[in-house]
Amino acid sequence: IWELKKDVYVVELDWYPDAPGEMVVLTCDTPEEDGITWTLDQSSEVLGSGKTLTIQVKEFGDAGQYTCHKGGEVLSHSLLLLHKKEDGIWSTDILKDQKEPKNKTFLRCEAKNYSGRFTCWWLTTISTDLTFSVKSSRGSSDPQGVTCGAATLSAERVRGDNKEYEYSVECQEDSACPAAEESLPIEVMVDAVHKLKYENYTSSFFIRDIIKPDPPKNLQLKPLKNSRQVEVSWEYPDTWSTPHSYFSLTFCVQVQGKSKREKKDRVFTDKTSATVICRKNASISVRAQDRYYSSSWSEWASVPCS
Amino acid sequence: RNLPVATPDPGMFPCLHHSQNLLRAVSNMLQKARQTLEFYPCTSEEIDHEDITKDKTSTVEACLPLELTKNESCLNSRETSFITNGSCLASRKTSFMMALCLSSIYEDLKMYQVEFKTMNAKLLMDPKRQIFLDQNMLAVIDELMQALNFNSETVPQKSSLEEPDFYKTKIKLCILLHAFRIRAVTIDRVMSYLNAS
């Protein structure tokens, strides 16, 4: 048993049929010695008396908020949550495996630049009785500070018969140098509680590996005289690290016909303009990627050829 | 990625082309190592990230873009130990910090060159003959060093009398390639920045 927050405790249980469970001794936080009674979850049924209460925790019915009283006055509370271990593996019932980029990916994170700011998100099919807390650091043995906000519900989607809820959190490394070469990874830890079930999830990464620039901005077409060619121009996204001559991007320009089956013409360039042939009903799209470190491409920025 | 390779203009900052070749070569070598040594801990997640130049050079600090010198987090350990001149510096661009920066890059390359050559000698003794260093990568390191043209003491190649542990050597190769790729990215950024200045 360990303390998660003030008056909130996690009982770690090996979860299998007829498991013996864990013996837990609760102590009433009071100088009083006599006339103390214990109840569970606003029930009037007295579970025991005395300054300590010994319970055998085997299932969720044994978890909850234990309260000690004296003469109608509440003295203290202890909330017991359960953390299940099945076949030596901690349960992952609360969050959905996103399976990207690999199996058992519960947390996904992205950064728009090298400023030390990043966003993580996760999915669940649970709609209520749910709470999260996010902590993060650079390295684990001698951790350096990363500050995370509160996790918020950021999207709801219908997937077949199920509703899926996306939560996200923003974090910022306390003293980040955009030019630094990372040798210690960022660690992200998410505590999750659903009803009386506790679970924790972790992710470890370098900012350089989760970079995904915003799409290029101000995408414009300029027709070239007496030609089917157009000059496409764009700019670096505002959110990208500066100076741009140091944090350079490379670009992919694509001409795509109306039909998905039509052949796509692609050009790669380090410049912020390109000359392409604009077909009728086609659209021109441009996306960006760090020029020197191949992390993710941005989403496409698009304009119609007409 | 199969990107069209731009050929540098004659008037271009001379080291940019070499640094682009360096990054390409080390990235290819790392990819080859990850594929060949697939049953060894050779991915970014599996290895310990060590920097053989730590406390010996200060490339990131010495080569910091002017715009980032206002960022206190970037100024933790700014060194000022190298004062030399090199042929990558067009005379009008010569400045103390730039010389310091390019000298630091040269020292990095020299250190990695020695490590890679020592390691390659060991790998050539491996009866499995599983992996060797790409001669192209070693040549590209050499070319960039020559373009930087700093007069520096030659570091003797390390020789070891004991029987090499090939497993450890291959893991060390992965660690070294990951670190060198990160440094090659920094070098490429620096050259691009200097070229635009």
């Epitope: 909130v8 979850d41 969720f60 908020q65 009803k195 | -």
Partner: nanobody, 120 residues
């Protein structure tokens, strides 16, 4: 901050029925238990019924078989269905919610109360 708003109270004849509702809003997090309490003039506040995440509903002896606590988690609402009402059920009824918000810790929230009067 979690807010609770009760509704559904009023004047009813003995033997009649009322359904009280309590809606929670704000950062509710994980609900530990809901409770309905009442306070008659000159008496202490007493627990009427509770519903916990880990177990079965619990009722004070005097209301067993007449009152039913239920909840609609999707609407963050708890109900108290009161049948066969008696004059001694006259009181102000309060809704209570105990929950856990990991960023804040445990909380214990109360509504402002709704008056129930049983009289002919």
């Amino acid at each position: 901050e979690v807010q609770l708003v009760e509704s559904g109270g009023g004047l009813v004849q003995p033997g009649g029925s009322l359904r009280l509702s309590c809606v929670a809003s704000g950062s509710i997090g994980s609900v530990v238990s809901w409770g309905w309490y009442r306070q008659a003039p000159g008496l202490e506040r007493e627990l009427v019924a509770s519903d916990a995440s880990g177990g079965r509903p619990n009722y004070q002896d005097s209301v067993k078989g007449r009152f039913t606590i239920s909840r609609d988690s999707a609407k963050n609402t708890v109900y108290l269905q009161m049948n066969s009402l008696k004059p001694e059920d006259t009181a102000v009824y309060y809704c209570n919610l105990r929950g856990l918000q990991l960023d804040m810790g445990l909380y214990d929230s109360w509504g402002q109360g709704t008056q129930v009067t049983v009289s002919s």
